[in-house]
């Protein structure tokens, strides 16, 4: 491991600070944990692919960026990063691919500057509802998190608890309304079948939402109305069949939105007429000329933008007496 020192070439001190009466102490010389690489100038500690089973206790106080990727952490207990003095500077924490299957309540407590958290590629069978909020109060202290990256955190089928995975994740996102300041949320590649209807309404600051590569069939009960800051919505590679009028109107009403809809199995029947009309008029869908029908068979690979109302028919439903076996 390397531990660059704050040699005679640089000098740290507590400067005049006009906005606060708190006096900051000069940081003490910091050691680099075993099996880690440290750069004080980059305020970065990398403990990568080291098969660590727990978070190092002797992290330097200067750390702003902490990479703990490719390890074997298994469980993040409460206060996993709590230190004396606290890691007051830690802003970006990457725990991806570290075989985490349990994140307990308060795992990220005592990290007052944590802005970006990446838990991707961990099989999170047990994500506490209070993993991010830290307490079970109905309204918690606001989390400083601005970006939360939770791509591919779905555990294998046989390791899931007897509960909805979507529900478990959403409970953690909504607990205590702690994540009201969240601006980026990535939930790609999680086999989500649905999006609980209340989740987006309680994340009003979202700018970027990535739900790509899931199994979402419908957005009928999902409201985007409150997401007035939303800039990008990634819905590629899902199982969407059609977007209905209510959803279309809400998306159109968002002032900065860009929507990505590629690689969904669009069903081009009479229910698609409103969406086709909207696609022809809207500027919010990126790459809209690439959207093609998947069903019915006769419509496969037809470009949505090239369809007209005559193309979009529904086979009549025969009354029971006329149906043949």
């Amino acid at each position: 491991s390397s531990s660059p020192t704050s040699s005679a070439s640089s000098f740290s001190s507590s400067a005049p600070f006009l906005a606060s009466a708190v006096s900051a102490q000069p940081p003490l010389p910091d050691q680099c944990p075993a099996l880690c690489e440290c750069s004080e100038a980059a305020r970065t500690v990398k403990c990568v692919n080291r098969n660590l089973t727990e978070v190092p206790t002797d992290l330097p106080a200067y750390v702003r960026n902490l990479f703990l990727t490719g390890n074997q952490l298994a469980v993040l207990p409460a206060g996993a990063f709590a230190r004396r003095p606290p890691l007051a500077e830690l802003a970006a924490l990457n725990l991806s691919g570290s075989r985490l299957d349990e994140v307990r309540a308060g795992a990220f407590e005592h990290l007052p500057s944590l802005r970006q958290l990446d838990l991707s590629h961990n099989p999170l069978a047990d994500l506490s509802p209070f993993a991010f909020s830290g307490s079970n109060a109905s309204v918690s202290a606001p989390s400083p998190l601005v970006e939360l990256i939770l791509n591919h955190i779905v555990p294998p089928e046989d390791e899931r608890q007897n509960r909805s995975f979507e529900g478990m994740v959403v409970a953690a996102l909504l607990a205590g309304r702690a994540l009201q300041g969240l601006r980026r949320l990535e939930l790609a590649s999680n086999h989500f079948l649905y999006l609980p209807r209340d989740v987006l309404a309680q994340l009003p600051s979202l700018r970027h939402l990535d739900l790509s590569n899931n199994s979402l069939v419908s957005l009928t009960y999902v409201s985007f109305r409150n997401l007035t800051h939303l800039e990008s919505l990634h819905l590629e590679d899902n199982a969407l069949k059609v977007l209905h009028n209510g959803t279309l109107a809400e998306l159109q009403g968002l002032p900065h939105i860009r929507v990505f809809l590629d690689n969904n199995p669009w069903v081009c029947d009479c229910h698609m007429a409103d969406m086709v009309t909207w696609l022809k008029e809207t500027e919010v869908v990126q790459g809209k000329d690439r959207l093609t029908c998947a069903y019915p068979e006769k419509m496969r690979n037809r470009v949505l933008l090239e369809l007209n109302s005559a193309d979009l028919d529904c086979d009549p439903i025969l009354p029971p007496s006329l149906q043949t076996s």
């Epitope: 507590s14 900051a24 000069p26 100038a41 305020r43 500077e89 802003a91 500057s113 970006q116 970006e147």
Partner: antibody, heavy 122, light 107 residues
Framework: QVQMQESGPGLVKPSETLSLSCTAS????????MNWVRQSAGKGLEWIGD????????TYNQKFKDRASLSVDKSRNWASLRLASVTAADTAVYYC???????????????WGPGVQVTVSS | EIVMTQSPDTLSVSPGETVTLSCRAS??????LHWYQQKPGQSPRLLIK???QSISAFPARFVGSGSGSEFTLTINNMQSEDVAVYYC?????????FGQGTKVDIK
């Protein structure tokens, strides 16, 4: 978008104190370290030091530590550099810069002010 | 302090050519090496971070490589708008230090 703007006198007399300020906008000021870098024909780009706007902790290049003083006023998204006892060798363009597109401070600068030319002369 | 040395000091190339700029650190800095482009009368702009990570504002013809103490910036298919001074920067150890720059212009 993220912007920085330096200001200060373009001419300073030898032995006096150079005083510059930098106003930042378009991001959360306390999230990112503020750096000062100068550029002169003779010495190229030189990093003077940085300050954490959250707590006022500074790190200085040893070359400047006895003469430089950095401070911030986070209520005004404002940072300042004072450089004492200047000589003609301190004639340079002075920049404030930050890493404000990314959350961790990573020892590089992706947002720079336009710079302010300072000449030390009597 | 870590001394950054760039070579050559100046380079004159024809449009469409490939340009190779070198940067050497006086000791290992892992991949904490950043490149900047500075055009006349402008501030430096971050071009490549961490030795090889591109910045979206710049075209893909700018490619960084290297690790440890030897680094290279390659400009493929040189264009007239690439005329500038290119600086490398140590981001590993305090004080942060820059190379003296390589000036690239068109023949």
């Amino acid at each position: 978008q993220v912007q920085m703007q330096e200001s200060g006198p373009g001419l300073v007399k030898p032995s006096e104190t150079l005083s510059l300020s930098c106003t930042a906008s378009g991001y959360t000021f306390t999230d990112f370290y503020m750096n000062w870098v100068r550029q002169s024909a003779g010495k190229g780009l030189e990093w003077i030091g940085d300050i954490n706007p959250n707590n006022g902790v500074t790190t200085y290049n040893q070359k400047f530590k006895d003469r430089a003083s950095l401070s911030v006023d986070k209520s005004r998204n404002w940072a300042s550099l004072r450089l004492a006892s200047v000589t003609a060798a301190d004639t340079a363009v002075y920049y404030c810069a930050t890493g404000a597109i990314h959350y961790g401070y990573d020892g590089y600068f992706d947002v720079w002010g336009p710079g302010v030319q300072v000449t030390v002369s009597s | 302090e870590i001394v950054m040395t760039q070579s050559p000091d100046t380079l004159s190339v024809s449009p469409g050519e490939t340009v190779t700029l070198s940067c050497r650190a006086s000791q290992s800095i892992s991949d904490y090496l950043h490149w900047y482009q500075q055009k006349p009368g402008q501030s430096p702009r971050l071009l490549i971070k961490y030795a090889s990570q591109s910045i979206s504002a710049f075209p893909a013809r700018f490619v960084g490589s290297g690790s440890g103490s030897e680094f290279t910036l390659t400009i493929n298919n040189m264009q007239s708008e690439d005329v500038a001074v290119y600086y490398c920067q140590n981001g590993h150890s305090f004080p942060l230090t820059f190379g003296q720059g390589t000036k690239v212009d068109i023949k």
